[in-house]
Interface confidence: low
């Protein structure tokens, strides 16, 4: 049995994945729950099993097709339901009319690499993963650099207000180990949010040449 209020949040990665988290204040005791996706304009539907991620929240990924296939468009509506088993029946715990392109969260950028490194600067590039062609160039990025002795939370955010898949980090300290992360967000969508941060890229600036200020 389920009591208490629930929150049901889903995001579309713009291609073939809808990730959902369902939070429930009340206790779920040995109950099997799933998310069911029923698109309004497609001849398919999809289900995923909700798995616990904390004491009161569950998550699952609706895999709609091949990772780079464009499974939904800007005018699709997907009815998403949380269904939990009660005996031999399924009970609807939550429901929403999901507009994929109003609820976007892209995959984290991938393939980070150092293009060129010097004593005080470093040029880094990356690629976006599984992003819809619908966006064209309407994407923005945030980047951060981890300096020695600091935490990621303390790192200042660098904002790139256009689809620019590279950055030149300036005013770095010579012969110093850094880490770099980037994330991406489409400009489209009322409830769109930032992608997860990329895997950190570690790099080291070149040492200063003896007797020279480079």
């Amino acid at each position: 049995a389920v009591n208490g209020t629930s929150q049901f949040t889903c995001f579309y990665n713009s291609r073939a994945n809808i990730s959902c988290v369902w939070s429930q204040d009340g206790a779920l005791q040995d109950t099997s729950c799933q998310v069911h996706a029923w698109p309004d304009r497609r001849r398919w539907n999809q289900t995923c099993e909700l798995l616990p991620v904390s004491q009161a929240s569950w998550a699952c990924n609706l895999i709609l097709g091949a990772p780079d296939s464009q499974k939904l468009t800007t005018v699709d509506i997907v009815t998403l339901r949380v269904l939990c088993r009660e005996g031999v029946r399924w009970r609807v715990m939550a429901i929403q009319d999901f507009k994929p392109f109003e609820n976007l969260r892209l995959m984290a950028p991938i393939s980070l690499q150092v293009v060129h490194v010097e004593t005080h600067r470093c040029n880094i590039s990356w690629e976006i993963s599984q992003a819809s062609h619908y966006f064209e160039r309407h994407l923005e990025f945030e980047a951060r650099t981890l300096s020695p002795g600091h935490t990621w939370e303390e790192a200042p955010l660098l904002t790139l207000k256009q689809k620019q898949e590279w950055i030149c980090l300036e005013t770095l300290t010579p012969d110093t180990q850094y880490e770099f992360q980037v994330r991406v967000k489409p400009l489209q969508g009322e409830f769109t949010t930032w992608s997860p941060w990329s895997q950190p890229l570690a790099f080291r600036t070149k040492p200063a040449a003896l007797g020279k200020d480079t």
């Epitope: 304009r41 497609r42 468009t73 800007t74 005018v75 009319d97 507009k99």
Partner: antibody, heavy 119, light 106 residues
Amino acid sequence: EVQLLESGGGLVQPGGSLRLSCAASGFSVTSYGVHWIRQAPGKGLEWLGVIWSGGSTDYNAAFISRLTISKDNSKNTVYFQMNSLRAEDTAVYYCARAGDYNYDGFAYWGQGTLVTVSS
Amino acid sequence: DIQMTQSPSSLSASVGDRVTITCQASSSVSFMYWYQQRPGKAPRLLIYDTSNLASGVPSRFSGSGSGTSYTFTISSLQPEDIATYYCQQWSTYPLTFGQGTKVEIK
């Protein structure tokens, strides 16, 4: 058999309001979106908005400030309300439903109801 | 908004003629639909998803195209085909229709 039946048309004063009903039979409005489309005399078709199965709406931006689409699931009926009417809102108003999926286009239409805005 | 431009706006053809109507979208669309409307009647869906025939529609009607350019064809015009034909896009809101093509018999 899927049927849509509009009602509530007639003569409306300029500046007045319009409330139309679309009674659905042969399907549930909790399972399908219902759209409103109008056609001015001798003119083409103009999409106004939709109410989806779960109750959310999408409107044509040109009408969003004066248009409300709602529904009563228990009566299986969709309602269309437009305010601040003017002469150019004179038209036949249709409700329509897609096939099993929107992908199938507007497969089902009501017969239409004529609204005349005039003093 | 995506503008849909149909041509011609009207045409007159003989029974048995092949009739072609084009619809040009102001930007690329993924889904195109065609409707027939007889005087005093509600529109009737003929073609969905660019080229698929709706239920009960005779095979003389067909559709094709992609991107911004779409075509609707009546392979052999019949007297009952006298009507106005509309294209419609369902790729972005607001949904928009062409201005219509009135087909008459010579």
